[in-house]
Interface confidence: low
């Protein structure tokens, strides 16, 4: 057993039939000696009398608050969450696995910039009875401070007979230096509770290889004179790190059919401009990624030939 | 050619080597980003090859300020990789395939680490540790661990060549 | 913090070999490299061997290079070092350090002052 925060205790159980449980003793938060007595949740059955409970926790039906009382009055709490772990594996019946980038994946990170700036998000189709809270550090050995705000949901969607939630996080290293090659990764822990199950979740990682640009701005294209080509210029996005002589982003630039069948014409190219041809119906998309480290490319930013 | 005492270095032919060297470095190993290797144990592999830390003004003020000290920590890690390329690591078993680009890579790390330091002057080299991996499986693991390591190296180094070459040729 | 006890020491003729040990206690060792430096009489403390975290990755000091093994046990929080075909000069007070950064500093291995945690020392003797 273990404390996860003030009053709130989590009991870790092998679950499997017949687990003989974890012998839990309980202490009441008060100065008196006399005329105790416990209780569980809203029930006024009377568990037991004295300072101490003891209580042998094997399912979720022996989890729960426990109060202590004298005479009617509310001396202290104590919840008791239960943690599962099967065949020596703990549970991940929360969250979903995303399966990307790989099976097993319940946290997914990314970052718009080198500038210690990240946000985590998760998947889940638990409506209710539900919190999250979450630590980051770089490096666990000797810890470097990360600050993250309040888990949030930040989107509904309906996934056939399903809907499925999603939270995020937003996180900033304490000391960032955009500069310098990582050589600790971000470790992000999330600690989930739904009704009185306990689980954790971990993902470990370098801003560098999460890093996703936000799309190229401005994107604006101007017809060469007598010529079917045109020429398609682009901003770096604001959200990048600065100065862009050193923070180099590389494009892709292409060229999109109406029809998904066409062929695509795609060039690669480290200026913010090129020279492509505009077809009739087709659109024009270009898409940015760090010049100089292969991380994910941003999503496309698109504008209509005609 | 970056001499200690200050003048510049060829900024412009170490931009085009060095994004040469980025290139290099993921075509050696381009699966990288699917294969998690910090989960596959002695982690610290990586942290025993050189990295550019926040302290070594390679950030652009820094190298408005002194390049020398980025540059000489950037030619520091270029021979520790060019040796560790050229040792039995990558030359033992498994066998790299013939076009195998950790020739070229190899190769490019010297051009870099050549052109950051004239001859006769001798910046402190590093002693490489005695990485000795008795398994094949176990001199692939290291490779791609090495690989990896030194494509985040690498980017570093040519956002520094990168910014100098814009705004610190003469 | 961590405490730090080499043991193993002792006198020993030329040729010969000891093995000494470092043990720790109050902090685990496995997240740390760890060195072994010496000091003979009216001489500065200098470099042995250096073993990273997870034995890796291992230096050692020309003079001892092919003679002297740096191991670690992380399950026994213990790191040894093997001396073998030993010479008059190898003769000195033999001492275990922590190294507190993870990462790798140039040749700040090679400086006793790059280490946080010290053990008292064990004398390793060896005549000809």
């Known amino acids: 057993i273990w404390e996860l925060k003030k009053d709130v205790y989590v009991v870790e159980l092998d679950w499997y039939p017949d687990a003989p449980g974890e012998m839990v003793v309980l202490t009441c938060d008060t100065p008196e000696e006399d005329g105790i007595t416990w209780t569980l949740d809203q029930s006024s059955e009377v568990l037991g009398s004295g300072k101490t409970l003891t209580i042998q926790v094997k399912e979720f039906g022996d989890a729960g608050q426990y109060t202590c009382h004298k005479g009617g009055e509310v001396l202290s709490h104590s919840l008791l969450l239960l943690h599962k772990k099967e065949d020596g594996i703990w549970s991940t019946d929360i969250l979903k696995d995303q399966k990307e980038p790989k099976n097993k994946t319940f946290l997914r990170c990314e970052a718009k910039n080198y500038s210690g700036r990240f946000t985590c998000w998760w998947l889940t189709t638990i409506s209710t009875d539900l919190t999250f809270s979450v630590k980051s550090s770089r490096g666990s050995s000797d810890p470097q401070g990360v600050t993250c705000g309040a888990a949030t949901l930040s989107a509904e969607r309906v996934r056939g007979d399903n809907k499925e939630y999603e939270y995020s996080v937003e996180c900033q290293e304490d000391s960032a230096c955009p500069a310098a090659e990582e050589s600790l990764p971000i470790e992000v822990m999330v600690d989930a509770v739904h009704k009185l199950k306990y689980e954790n979740y971990t993902s470990s990682f370098f801003i560098r290889d999460i890093i996703k640009p936000d799309p190229p701005k401005n994107l604006q294209l101007k017809p060469l004179k007598n010529s079917r080509q045109v020429e398609v210029s682009w901003e770096y996005p604001d959200t990048w790190s600065t100065p862009h002589s050193y923070f180099s982003l590389t494009f892709c630039v292409q060229v999109q059919g109406k029809s998904k069948r066409e062929k695509k014409d795609r060039v690669f190219t480290d200026k913010t401009s090129a020279t492509v041809i505009c077809r009739k119906n087709a659109s024009i998309s270009v898409r940015a990624q760090d010049r100089y480290y292969s991380s994910s490319w941003s999503e496309w930013a698109s504008v209509p030939c005609s | 050619r970056a001499v200690p005492g200050g003048s510049s270095p060829a900024w412009t032919q170490c931009q085009q080597l060095s994004q040469k060297l980025c290139t290099l470095a993921w075509s050696a190993h381009p699966l990288v980003g699917h294969m998690d290797l910090r989960e596959e144990g002695d982690e610290e592999t990586t942290n025993d090859v050189p990295h550019i830390q926040c302290g070594d003004g390679c950030d652009p003020q820094g190298l408005r300020d002194n390049s020398q000290f980025c540059l000489q920590r950037i030619h520091q890690g270029l021979i520790f990789y060019e040796k560790l390329l050229g040792s039995d690591i990558f030359t033992g078993e498994p066998s790299l395939l013939p076009d195998s680009p950790v020739g070229q890579l190899h190769a490019s790390l010297l051009g870099l680490s050549q052109l950051l330091q004239p001859e006769g002057h001798h910046w402190e080299t590093q002693q490489i540790p005695s990485l000795s991996p008795s398994q094949p499986w176990q001199r692939l693991l290291l490779r791609f661990k090495i690989l990896r390591s030194l494509q985040a190296f690498v980017a570093v180094a040519a956002r520094v060549f990168a910014h100098g070459a814009a705004t610190l040729s003469p | 913090e961590v405490q730090l006890v080499e043991s193993g020491g002792g006198l020993v003729q030329a040729g010969g070999s000891l093995r000494l040990s470092c043990a720790a206690s109050?902090?685990?060792?496995?997240?740390?490299?760890m060195g072994w430096f010496r000091q003979a009489p009216g001489k500065e403390r200098e470099f042995v061997a250096r073993i990273s975290q997870g034995g890796t990755a291992i230096y050692y000091a020309d003079s001892v290079k092919g003679r002297f093994t740096i191991s670690r046990d992380n399950a026994k929080n213990t790191v040894y070092l093997q001396m073998n075909s030993l010479k008059p000069e190898d003769t000195a007070v033999y001492y275990c350090a922590k190294d507190p950064s993870p990462y790798y500093r140039g040749s700040a291995y090679l400086l006793s002052g790059s280490y946080d945690s010290w053990g008292q020392g064990t004398q390793v003797t060896v005549s000809s």
């Open positions: 109050g902090r685990t060792l496995s997240s740390y490299a």
